[in-house]
Structures are given as structure tokens and as C-alpha cells.
């Protein structure tokens, strides 16, 4: 029975040219995490394997950095980076848990303006 839940950073926005941290956290389960996959729509960005560590997909190695923790840092953001990101936790005995993050990439001035009106 799958009792765990994934908490994510939810909907986030960041400036074009800037960087953003994608974070997920699996809680409420004693399942062992064997691997975390980070995907953007249908593209695999990176994995963190419990035995062998981080592996970044060749097409993203210049703009993706592992961490912090099981999170992922996206750098030099472009408008093409906007959209859905998924963290997929491979665990046993539970199976897979999936979290979703939606990233909006804004022009610098818009991002700064939006930040003044964020609800804490």
C-alpha cells in the first residue's frame, strides 16, 4: 500500500537567464528510495541513483546541476524551459511516486515586479 506523499515547490517563476531550484520531498512512508528521476515533459533531465549517484542527461549537462539534496538546479533559463517538471521517486516496497512542478520563465522586469506582490 502506498502511504507516502510528495511535497513539491508547486508553481514557481524565475527570470530568463537566471536559475531555479526544483525540489521534491517524499514523506509519510518508510519505503526505500532507489532512484529519483527528473523529467521535463517527456525528456529525462537527470537521475540520482541510490547506489551510483547523479547522472545528468548529455543534452542538459551544461545547464543542469545536481542538488541541493535530491533536487535539481536549472541554470541560464530560457523561455523554452517553461512548463511542467516531474520528480519520480522509485521506491520499494511502495513503487513510484510522482510530483509535479510548473515553471514559468519571465522577462527580468516582469519577474522583479511579480516578486513585490508575492503572497508569503
Amino acid at each position: 500500500m502506498m502511504t507516502g506523499t510528495i511535497e513539491t515547490t508547486g508553481n514557481i517563476s524565475a527570470e530568463k537567464g537566471g536559475s531555479i531550484i526544483l525540489q521534491c520531498h517524499l514523506s509519510s512512508t518508510t519505503a526505500q528510495v532507489t532512484q529519483v528521476n527528473w523529467e521535463q515533459q517527456d525528456q529525462l533531465l537527470a537521475i540520482c541513483n541510490a547506489d551510483l549517484g547523479w547522472h545528468i542527461s548529455p543534452s542538459f549537462k551544461d545547464r543542469v546541476a545536481p542538488g541541493p539534496g535530491l533536487g535539481l538546479t536549472l541554470q541560464s533559463l530560457t523561455v523554452n524551459d517553461a512548463g511542467e517538471y516531474f520528480c519520480i521517486y522509485h521506491t520499494y516496497p511502495d513503487g513510484t511516486y510522482t510530483g509535479r512542478i510548473f515553471l514559468e520563465v519571465l522577462e527580468s522586469s516582469v519577474a522583479e515586479h511579480g516578486a513585490r506582490f508575492q503572497i508569503p
Epitope: 528521476n37 537521475i47 551510483l52 547522472h55 522509485h90 521506491t91 520499494y92 516496497p93 513503487g95
Partner: antibody
Framework: QVQLVQSGTEVKKPGASVKVSCKAS????????ITWVRQAPGQGLEWMGW????????NYAQKLQGRVTMTTDTSTSTAYMELRSLRSDDTAVYYC??????????????WGQGTLVTVSS | DIQMTQSPSSLSASVGDRVTITCRAS??????LAWYQQKPGKVPKVLIY???TLQSGVPSRFSGSGSGTDFTLTISSLQPEDVATYYC?????????FGGGTKVEIK
Amino acid sequence: QVQLVQSGTEVKKPGASVKVSCKASGYTFSSYAITWVRQAPGQGLEWMGWISAYNGNTNYAQKLQGRVTMTTDTSTSTAYMELRSLRSDDTAVYYCARVDFWSGYNYFDYWGQGTLVTVSS
Amino acid sequence: DIQMTQSPSSLSASVGDRVTITCRASQGISNYLAWYQQKPGKVPKVLIYAASTLQSGVPSRFSGSGSGTDFTLTISSLQPEDVATYYCQKSNSAPLTFGGGTKVEIK
């Protein structure tokens, strides 16, 4: 096409070491892991350990810990497995295989042809 | 460590028969299980991964099922070329232990 080509048959004396090579072609070597599996004559498959060709991280079977070392050379797309302090029960065919871990399911999708290592005095 | 137990250790069946091999994990592993076929004198070959996903190029008479601790490999209609030893393997994390194998022969 993906190919893993292993080094040839070895005959060793007890207490010696052996180093088996596994040359990969047909894919981006550093994007996958390599595992080593052995099979004693007439016996089943025994997992020995695996190594990431991306970062060099390893994980070995507990019973071989301290006697086995797995390495990779990305410049030649070659994986190596060294086994030390050989005993007669290390006589086996040694296989390397590519691990598809991107899916999260860690299965061995391509295998080398095997290297027979005989340990005999 | 999680142990993998296969049964039977050997079986003999007629061409066209439905053949079932079982694999049991000592603890739950969800669907992190692969099946391999090793023909006499040949290199092992993956048939199924993720418990039920058929590897590309594998005939559709092979199928896998199960989750948790109990898994099954089924050959829907045994063919002469299926004579081999079949191994299950836990594929979640190290150690990536194999079952003891099931030898399939033709009657």
C-alpha cells in the same frame, strides 16, 4: 549497434589476480553503468557489482568486498574488473553487461560474450 | 539482503504447452524485477523488465506479471527454441540478486 567485447580466456594460480576488460561500442559509454556477473560451471548467475561510467561510483556484492575492483576508462570506452586473491571457487565465466538505469529499473540490456577464468594450481 | 527464490528448478513440457515459472522475493520489491533467458552455451538475454514490460524484439508469447513479492514468467505456447534456463532478478538497488534459475526442457 551496441556491442560489449571482453578480453580472452585466463588461467591463474590460486592467490593471483586477474583483470578482465570489456570494450563498449555503439552507444555513449559515459551515459550508462556497467555491471559484472559471473557463472561458475553448471551454476547460476551471480551479481558481482556495478560501476557508473559517468562518475566512477561503484557498489560491490558483499561477499566480494575487498577482493574486487571495478574501473572504467572513458577515453577508450572500456570497463575493467579486477579480482584478487583468487581461489578455485572463482573459476567461472565472467560477463560484463550494460545497465539501463535511466528508467529506474536497472536491467541488463546488452551483454559481453563472457571471459572464462580458470583458477588452478 | 533480499533473497530471490525461483520454482520449479526444472521442468519438462511439450511444444505448445503453457509454461509458468514463479519467483518470490523475501521482501516486497514493487515491480522492480527482470527476467533473463540463457540458452545452453550462450549469453543471458533480458526478456522482461519492470515485472511486465517486454524488451524490444522478444516474442509476445513471453509475458511477466506480479508485484510485491510474487512474480510469474509465462510462455504461452512453448517452442523448441525456448529450451533454456530462466532467471529472475531484483532490479531495484544493490545487490541486484538473481534467482537460482529454472531449466526448461522439451518433453
